[in-house]
Amino acid sequence: PEPPTACREKQYLINSQCCSLCQPGQKLVSDCTEFTETECLPCGESEFLDTWNRETHCHQHKYCDPNLGLRVQQKGTSETDTICTCEEGWHCTSEACESCVLHRSCSPGFGVKQIATGVSDTICEPCPVGFFSNVSSAFEKCHPWTSCETKDLVVQQAGTNKTDVVCGPQDRLRA
């Protein structure tokens, strides 16, 4: 018979032959032959593989480094990685939670809608028209543009979401 060009799900093609992939939690020791099945071995302690695979090495479990404020949220198994979270009151910097911050700052152009708590991180909101923020802050709201009119001045430069308006003297018409 013709050698296969494609294999079924949970199989892989090698040496013109379809071999079974190793199940999650196991790594490949040797490919199958005409006479033998694929040989797989369980991952060691602190290792995992989370898919049907033909990997010859298992992945190391993630280390939740206490020096970065991390602790184990869920211990890894032979089929799953360790899940880290931050110490109480601290917040993950990303979905992968590789480091912790006390809270995030809102960038210029954004103001703080809600200051961080032990449970939730800073909530930012864009400064609407008429308001601005020119700093990165974890507590400052958007500030209203200066009202030039109340100072008997005129707008010389329009404000943006990141800058205040610039006021200047009114042009005096000469007689």
Epitope: N67, L68, G69, C86, E87, W90, S99, C100, V101, L102, H103, R104, S105, V135, S136, S137, A138, F139, E140
Partner: nanobody, 116 residues
């Protein structure tokens, strides 16, 4: 290397006062927003007070409003927290923190104990 060193804590009676300091080194202090946070025994972190990079804006948690005052001296690279009318519930380790507020930037803290 960024370093924050808190000092000024101690044992004080209810109604008393303390002034905490946070000496910074390893970065240009001026222009950075700075925070005081605290952790009471067996409790989570509480954000106490903050001061803007310019010193023109401040924030106080409701629990300390009217009793605590935050200030900064950029020439001395030092942040302060003046604490008056202290209460038993102010007992905690107090830390200062700077943007970007990484866990590894925090200082060792200074313990404030309010007890008679």
């Amino acid at each position: 290397e960024v370093q924050l060193l808190e000092s000024g804590g101690g044992l004080v009676q209810p109604g008393g006062s303390l002034r905490l300091s946070c000496a910074a080194s390893g970065f240009t202090f001026a222009g950075y927003e700075l925070w005081w946070v605290r952790q009471a025994p067996g409790k989570g972190l509480e954000r106490v007070s903050a001061i803007s990079g310019s010193g023109g804006s401040t924030y106080y948690a409701d629990s300390v409003k009217g009793r605590f005052t935050i200030s900064r001296d950029d020439s001395k690279n030092t942040l302060y927290l003046q604490m008056n009318s202290l209460r038993a519930e102010d007992t905690a380790v107090y830390y200062c923190a700077k943007d970007p507020y990484s866990f590894d930037y925090r200082g060792q803290g200074t313990l404030v104990t309010v007890s008679s």
